[in-house]
C-alpha cells in the first residue's frame, strides 16, 4: 500500500495556504474534485468542491476556499484565505468518481495556524483580503455527501503541533454558497 | 530512504546526442512530478525541464525546446532526458529533482551528472 | 517568463550574524517561492518551500518570509556550516520555474 504522508505548513492568521493536487489529467481532467478536512476518528468532511464535471481553469469559492481546476496541467489549485487559528488541521483532495469511492491525492496537508500576523514586508495578508471582497455571484454547489470509510481509519495521529480542537469548525459561510471569481495568480 | 541517481553525462561533440538516466528509490515514484535542473561550471541553477508524475504533462525551458525530451517509465521508476542537438552551452551538471507534491519547489536531488559538449 | 532578482549576490559574514537575502520576483506568485542552500561540488539542498514552510529537517535557524512579490530568507545565527550559495525558485502553480542568480554567503 502506499505510505500516506503529510506536508506541514504553517502560517499566521490572516495569511492565505495557496497549495496545489496533482492527478493524472488522462483520468481525471473533467471529474468533480473535493477539499476535505479529516477530523481524528471522523468521516472526511467536504469542506469544498469544483462542479460536476469540473471546468478547466474556472475559480470556484466557497467562503474562504477557492478551488481552480487546470486541466491542462492536471492540478487542482486550493487557496484558504484569511486564516483562523481553527483551520488547523489535517487536509486532502480527493477526486470523486461514482459510483467508486472517492480517489485521494497525496500528500496530505497539515495545517497549523498561528496568532498574530508576522507583519512582514510583502506578506500575503493583503494580497488574499482583496481576493475576499469580490463580490459574490452565487449558485448551488453540488458536493457528494459521502466519503470512503477506508479514509477514517487512514488518518494519522495528529501532531502535536496541531493546536485544533476536535470540535473545531472551520468557519465557513453556507456551504452550499459557491461564488465564481475572476483568474489572478 | 528517498534517492536519485543520475547517469548517461559525458563527453559529446556539439550536434550530438546524449539520454541522461535518473534512478529513483524510495518513494511512490508514479505519484511525483520530475525535473531536470542544470548548472553550467561557476553558475547559477537553470530549469531544464519537468513531467507529471503519469508523464501526461511535459515542460521545458525556451533554451532546449525542440532538441531536449523527458520522458519516464514509471513501471522502472525512471526518469529521462534526452539530449539531440547539443551545443556547447548546454555543458553543465545536470541534476534530476522531485517536486513536492503541494508545491512547486524540489525536495530531493541527485547527485548530478556531468555533460561536457566540446569538439 | 517570470524573472527572479536576488540581491546581495554576495555577502561576507560572521559567525553569529544575522543574514537577509531578499528575491523580488517581476510579478505576483503570491506563495510559490522555495530557497536552497547549495555548497560547492554538491547538489542543492531545499530549505523552505511555500515562501515561509520549513522543509523537514532543516534548523530553525533559517526562515522565510514574503508573499506576492518580494521575499526574504533570514538566517537568525550564522553558523560555520551556513557558508554556502543560496538560491530563490519560483513556478506559478506550474512550470516554467525559475531560478534567482544566488547569494554567496562567505565569511568575513
Known amino acids: 500500500a502506499t505510505k500516506l504522508t503529510e506536508e506541514k505548513y504553517e502560517l499566521k492568521e490572516g495569511q492565505t495556504l495557496d497549495v496545489k493536487c496533482d492527478y493524472t489529467l488522462e483520468k481525471f481532467a473533467s471529474s468533480q474534485k473535493a477539499w476535505q478536512i479529516i477530523r481524528d476518528g471522523e468521516m472526511p468532511k467536504t469542506l469544498a468542491c469544483t462542479e460536476r464535471p469540473s471546468k478547466n481553469s474556472h475559480p470556484v469559492q466557497v467562503g474562504r476556499i477557492i478551488l481552480e481546476d487546470y486541466h491542462d496541467h492536471g492540478l487542482l489549485r486550493v487557496r484558504m484565505v484569511n486564516l483562523q487559528v481553527e483551520d488547523s488541521g489535517l487536509y486532502q483532495c480527493v477526486i470523486y468518481q461514482p459510483p467508486k469511492e472517492p480517489h485521494m491525492l497525496f500528500d496530505r496537508i497539515r495545517l497549523v495556524v498561528t496568532k498574530g500576523f508576522s507583519g512582514t514586508p510583502g506578506s500575503n495578508e493583503n494580497s488574499t483580503q482583496n481576493v475576499y471582497k469580490i463580490p459574490p455571484t452565487t449558485t448551488k454547489a453540488l458536493c457528494p455527501l459521502y466519503t470512503s470509510p477506508r479514509t477514517v481509519t487512514q488518518a494519522p495521529p495528529k501532531s502535536t503541533a496541531d493546536v485544533s480542537t476536535p470540535d473545531s469548525e472551520i468557519n465557513l459561510t453556507n456551504v452550499t454558497d459557491i461564488i465564481r471569481v475572476p483568474v489572478f495568480n | 530512504e528517498v534517492q536519485l541517481l543520475e547517469s548517461g553525462g559525458g563527453l559529446v561533440q556539439p550536434g550530438g546526442s546524449l539520454r541522461l538516466s535518473c534512478a529513483a528509490s524510495?518513494?511512490?515514484?508514479?505519484?511525483?512530478?520530475m525535473s531536470w535542473v542544470r548548472q553550467a561550471p561557476g553558475k547559477g541553477l537553470e530549469w531544464v525541464s519537468a513531467i507529471s508524475g503519469s508523464g501526461g504533462s511535459t515542460y521545458y525551458a525556451d533554451s532546449v525546446k525542440g532538441r531536449f525530451t523527458i520522458s519516464r517509465d514509471n513501471s522502472k521508476n525512471t526518469l529521462y532526458l534526452q539530449m539531440n542537438s547539443l551545443r556547447a552551452e548546454d555543458t553543465a551538471v545536470y541534476y534530476c529533482a522531485k517536486s513536492k507534491h503541494s508545491t512547486t519547489s524540489l525536495d530531493v536531488w541527485g547527485q548530478g551528472t556531468m555533460v561536457t559538449v566540446s569538439s | 517568463d517570470i524573472q527572479l532578482t536576488q540581491s546581495p549576490s554576495s555577502v561576507s559574514a560572521s559567525v553569529g550574524d544575522r543574514v537577509t537575502i531578499t528575491c523580488r520576483a517581476s510579478q505576483d506568485i503570491s506563495s510559490w517561492l522555495a530557497w536552497y542552500q547549495q555548497k560547492p561540488g554538491k547538489a542543492p539542498k531545499l530549505l523552505i518551500y511555500a515562501a515561509s514552510s520549513l522543509q523537514s529537517g532543516v534548523p530553525s535557524r533559517f526562515s522565510g518570509s514574503g508573499s506576492g512579490t518580494d521575499f526574504t530568507l533570514t538566517i537568525s545565527s550564522l553558523q560555520p556550516e551556513d557558508f554556502a550559495t543560496y538560491y530563490c525558485?519560483?513556478?506559478?502553480?506550474?512550470?516554467?520555474?525559475?531560478f534567482g542568480g544566488g547569494t554567496k554567503v562567505e565569511i568575513k
Open positions: 525558485q519560483q513556478a506559478v502553480i506550474h512550470p516554467p520555474y525559475t
Open positions: 524510495g518513494f511512490t515514484f508514479s505519484t511525483y512530478a
